[in-house]
């Protein structure tokens, strides 16, 4: 069971300092941006991180949403990352959900975050280069110290 708490506005970057944004095709991508680029591209660069209480002690449960024309929420259904047109629900009556991730601070690096899927244990949000695009994907952690699954989260509130 997950119950919604508060939400905050955040900019999410990979460890190469590329900014996460949602493109015109609703795809989550990373791109080099200056601070002014980041501001100019809002609201596509501003993510709503909603926190949830969890009935089990597993970590800080969150959803990641963006509000362009409508609110879309990040999902990892079938291990495929996509934004679904939906508001983060107030309650989720299950112990797993495709839209719930556990936000984890890497030990020894308080400012580095990982997002583990609640549906697929051991699978994390990651940045992966595909041709010329840097995409947000769901990835099984396969090597120690994998930088692709680490992000910084800057609060914009």
């Amino acid at each position: 069971y997950f119950g919604k708490l508060e939400s905050k506005l955040s900019v999410i970057r990979n460890l190469n300092d590329q900014v996460l944004f949602i493109d015109q095709g609703n795809r989550p991508l990373f791109e080099d941006m200056t601070d002014s680029d980041c501001r100019d591209n809002a609201p596509r660069t501003i993510f709503i991180i909603s926190m949830y209480k969890d009935s089990q002690p597993r970590g800080m449960a969150v959803t990641i949403s963006v509000k362009c024309e409508k609110i879309s929420t990040l999902s990892c259904e079938n291990k495929i990352i996509s934004f679904k047109e939906m508001n983060p629900p107030d309650n989720i009556k299950d112990t797993k959900s495709d839209i719930i991730f556990f936000q984890r601070s890497v030990p020894g690096h308080d400012n580095k975050m990982q997002f583990e899927s609640s549906s697929y244990e051991g699978y994390f949000l990651a940045c992966e280069k595909e041709r010329d695009l840097f995409k947000l994907i769901l990835k099984k952690e396969d090597e120690l110290g994998d930088r692709s699954i680490m992000f910084t989260v800057q609060n914009e509130d």
């Epitope: 708490l5 969890d54 800080m60 984890r104 030990p107 308080d110 120690l144």
Partner: antibody
């Protein structure tokens, strides 16, 4: 770097209560879990329970259920552990520990507070 | 009350490799991650290994963790005198809905 600073040593009478504090400085407090772990003289570690300050959710080890109360004050970034109906076997060093990665991965520890229960 | 079983003591000469075992059951290690802590004499414990085999920053790569079935182990290579300490394994036990520690292993560097 987060630092957890605990209150000083206590000497208590059997049957009384003790309240130990744990103040966090230099980092985020509210969205992570704070656990309490105790260690009797010459013995191993024993988890008592934890709290997630942001939600106020608490989880207690069955052994301490009904005798321990863990609270947190977000405004002062301080967590508290109160243990009641003290007996001599409760003589131990009590540690607070922060869990930022997972509620059960204790990545930062306080210096410990010695509680002695003696008549 | 101790659910995870560790040897009370191990020893090794400087430069040697030692391992510390931690045995549990399907209700804890068999289905959950294992963490390891080092406690130097007179100090608070320190996180050494988390999620079976991950090292926090600042922990030397001489320390490594592994898990197989319902057991886990901590390996220390190139043993140094400053490694002399108590080592504890930890996991989640869903039968007691509680986190559990091993009884601890005292490492002596000869």
């Amino acid at each position: 770097e987060v630092q957890l600073v605990q209150s000083g040593a206590e000497v208590k009478k059997p049957g009384s209560s003790v309240k130990v504090s744990c103040k966090a400085s230099g980092g985020t407090f509210n969205s992570y879990a704070i656990s309490w772990v105790r260690q009797a003289p010459g013995q191993g570690l024993e988890w008592m329970g934890n709290i997630i300050p942001m939600t106020g959710q608490t989880y207690y080890a069955q052994k301490f259920q009904g005798r321990v109360t863990i609270t947190a004050d977000e405004s002062t970034s301080t967590a508290y552990m109160e243990l009641s109906s003290l007996r001599s076997e409760d003589t131990a060093v009590y540690y607070c520990a922060r869990a930022a990665y997972h509620p059960l991965v204790f990545d930062n520890w306080g210096q410990g507070t010695l509680v002695t229960v003696s008549s | 009350d101790i659910v995870l079983t560790q040897p009370p003591s191990v020893s090794g000469a400087p430069g040697q490799r030692v391992t510390i075992s931690c045995s549990g059951s399907s209700s804890n290690i068999g289905n959950h991650y294992v963490n390891w802590y080092q406690q130097l004499p007179g100090t608070a414990p320190k996180l050494l290994i988390y999620r079976n085999n991950h090292r926090p920053s600042g922990v030397p790569d001489r320390f490594s963790g592994s898990k197989s079935g319902t057991s886990a182990s901590l390996a220390i290579t190139g043993l140094q005198s400053e490694d002399e300490a108590d080592y504890y394994c930890q996991s989640w036990d869903y039968s007691g809905f509680s986190t559990v520690f091993g009884g601890g292993t005292k490492l002596t560097v000869l």
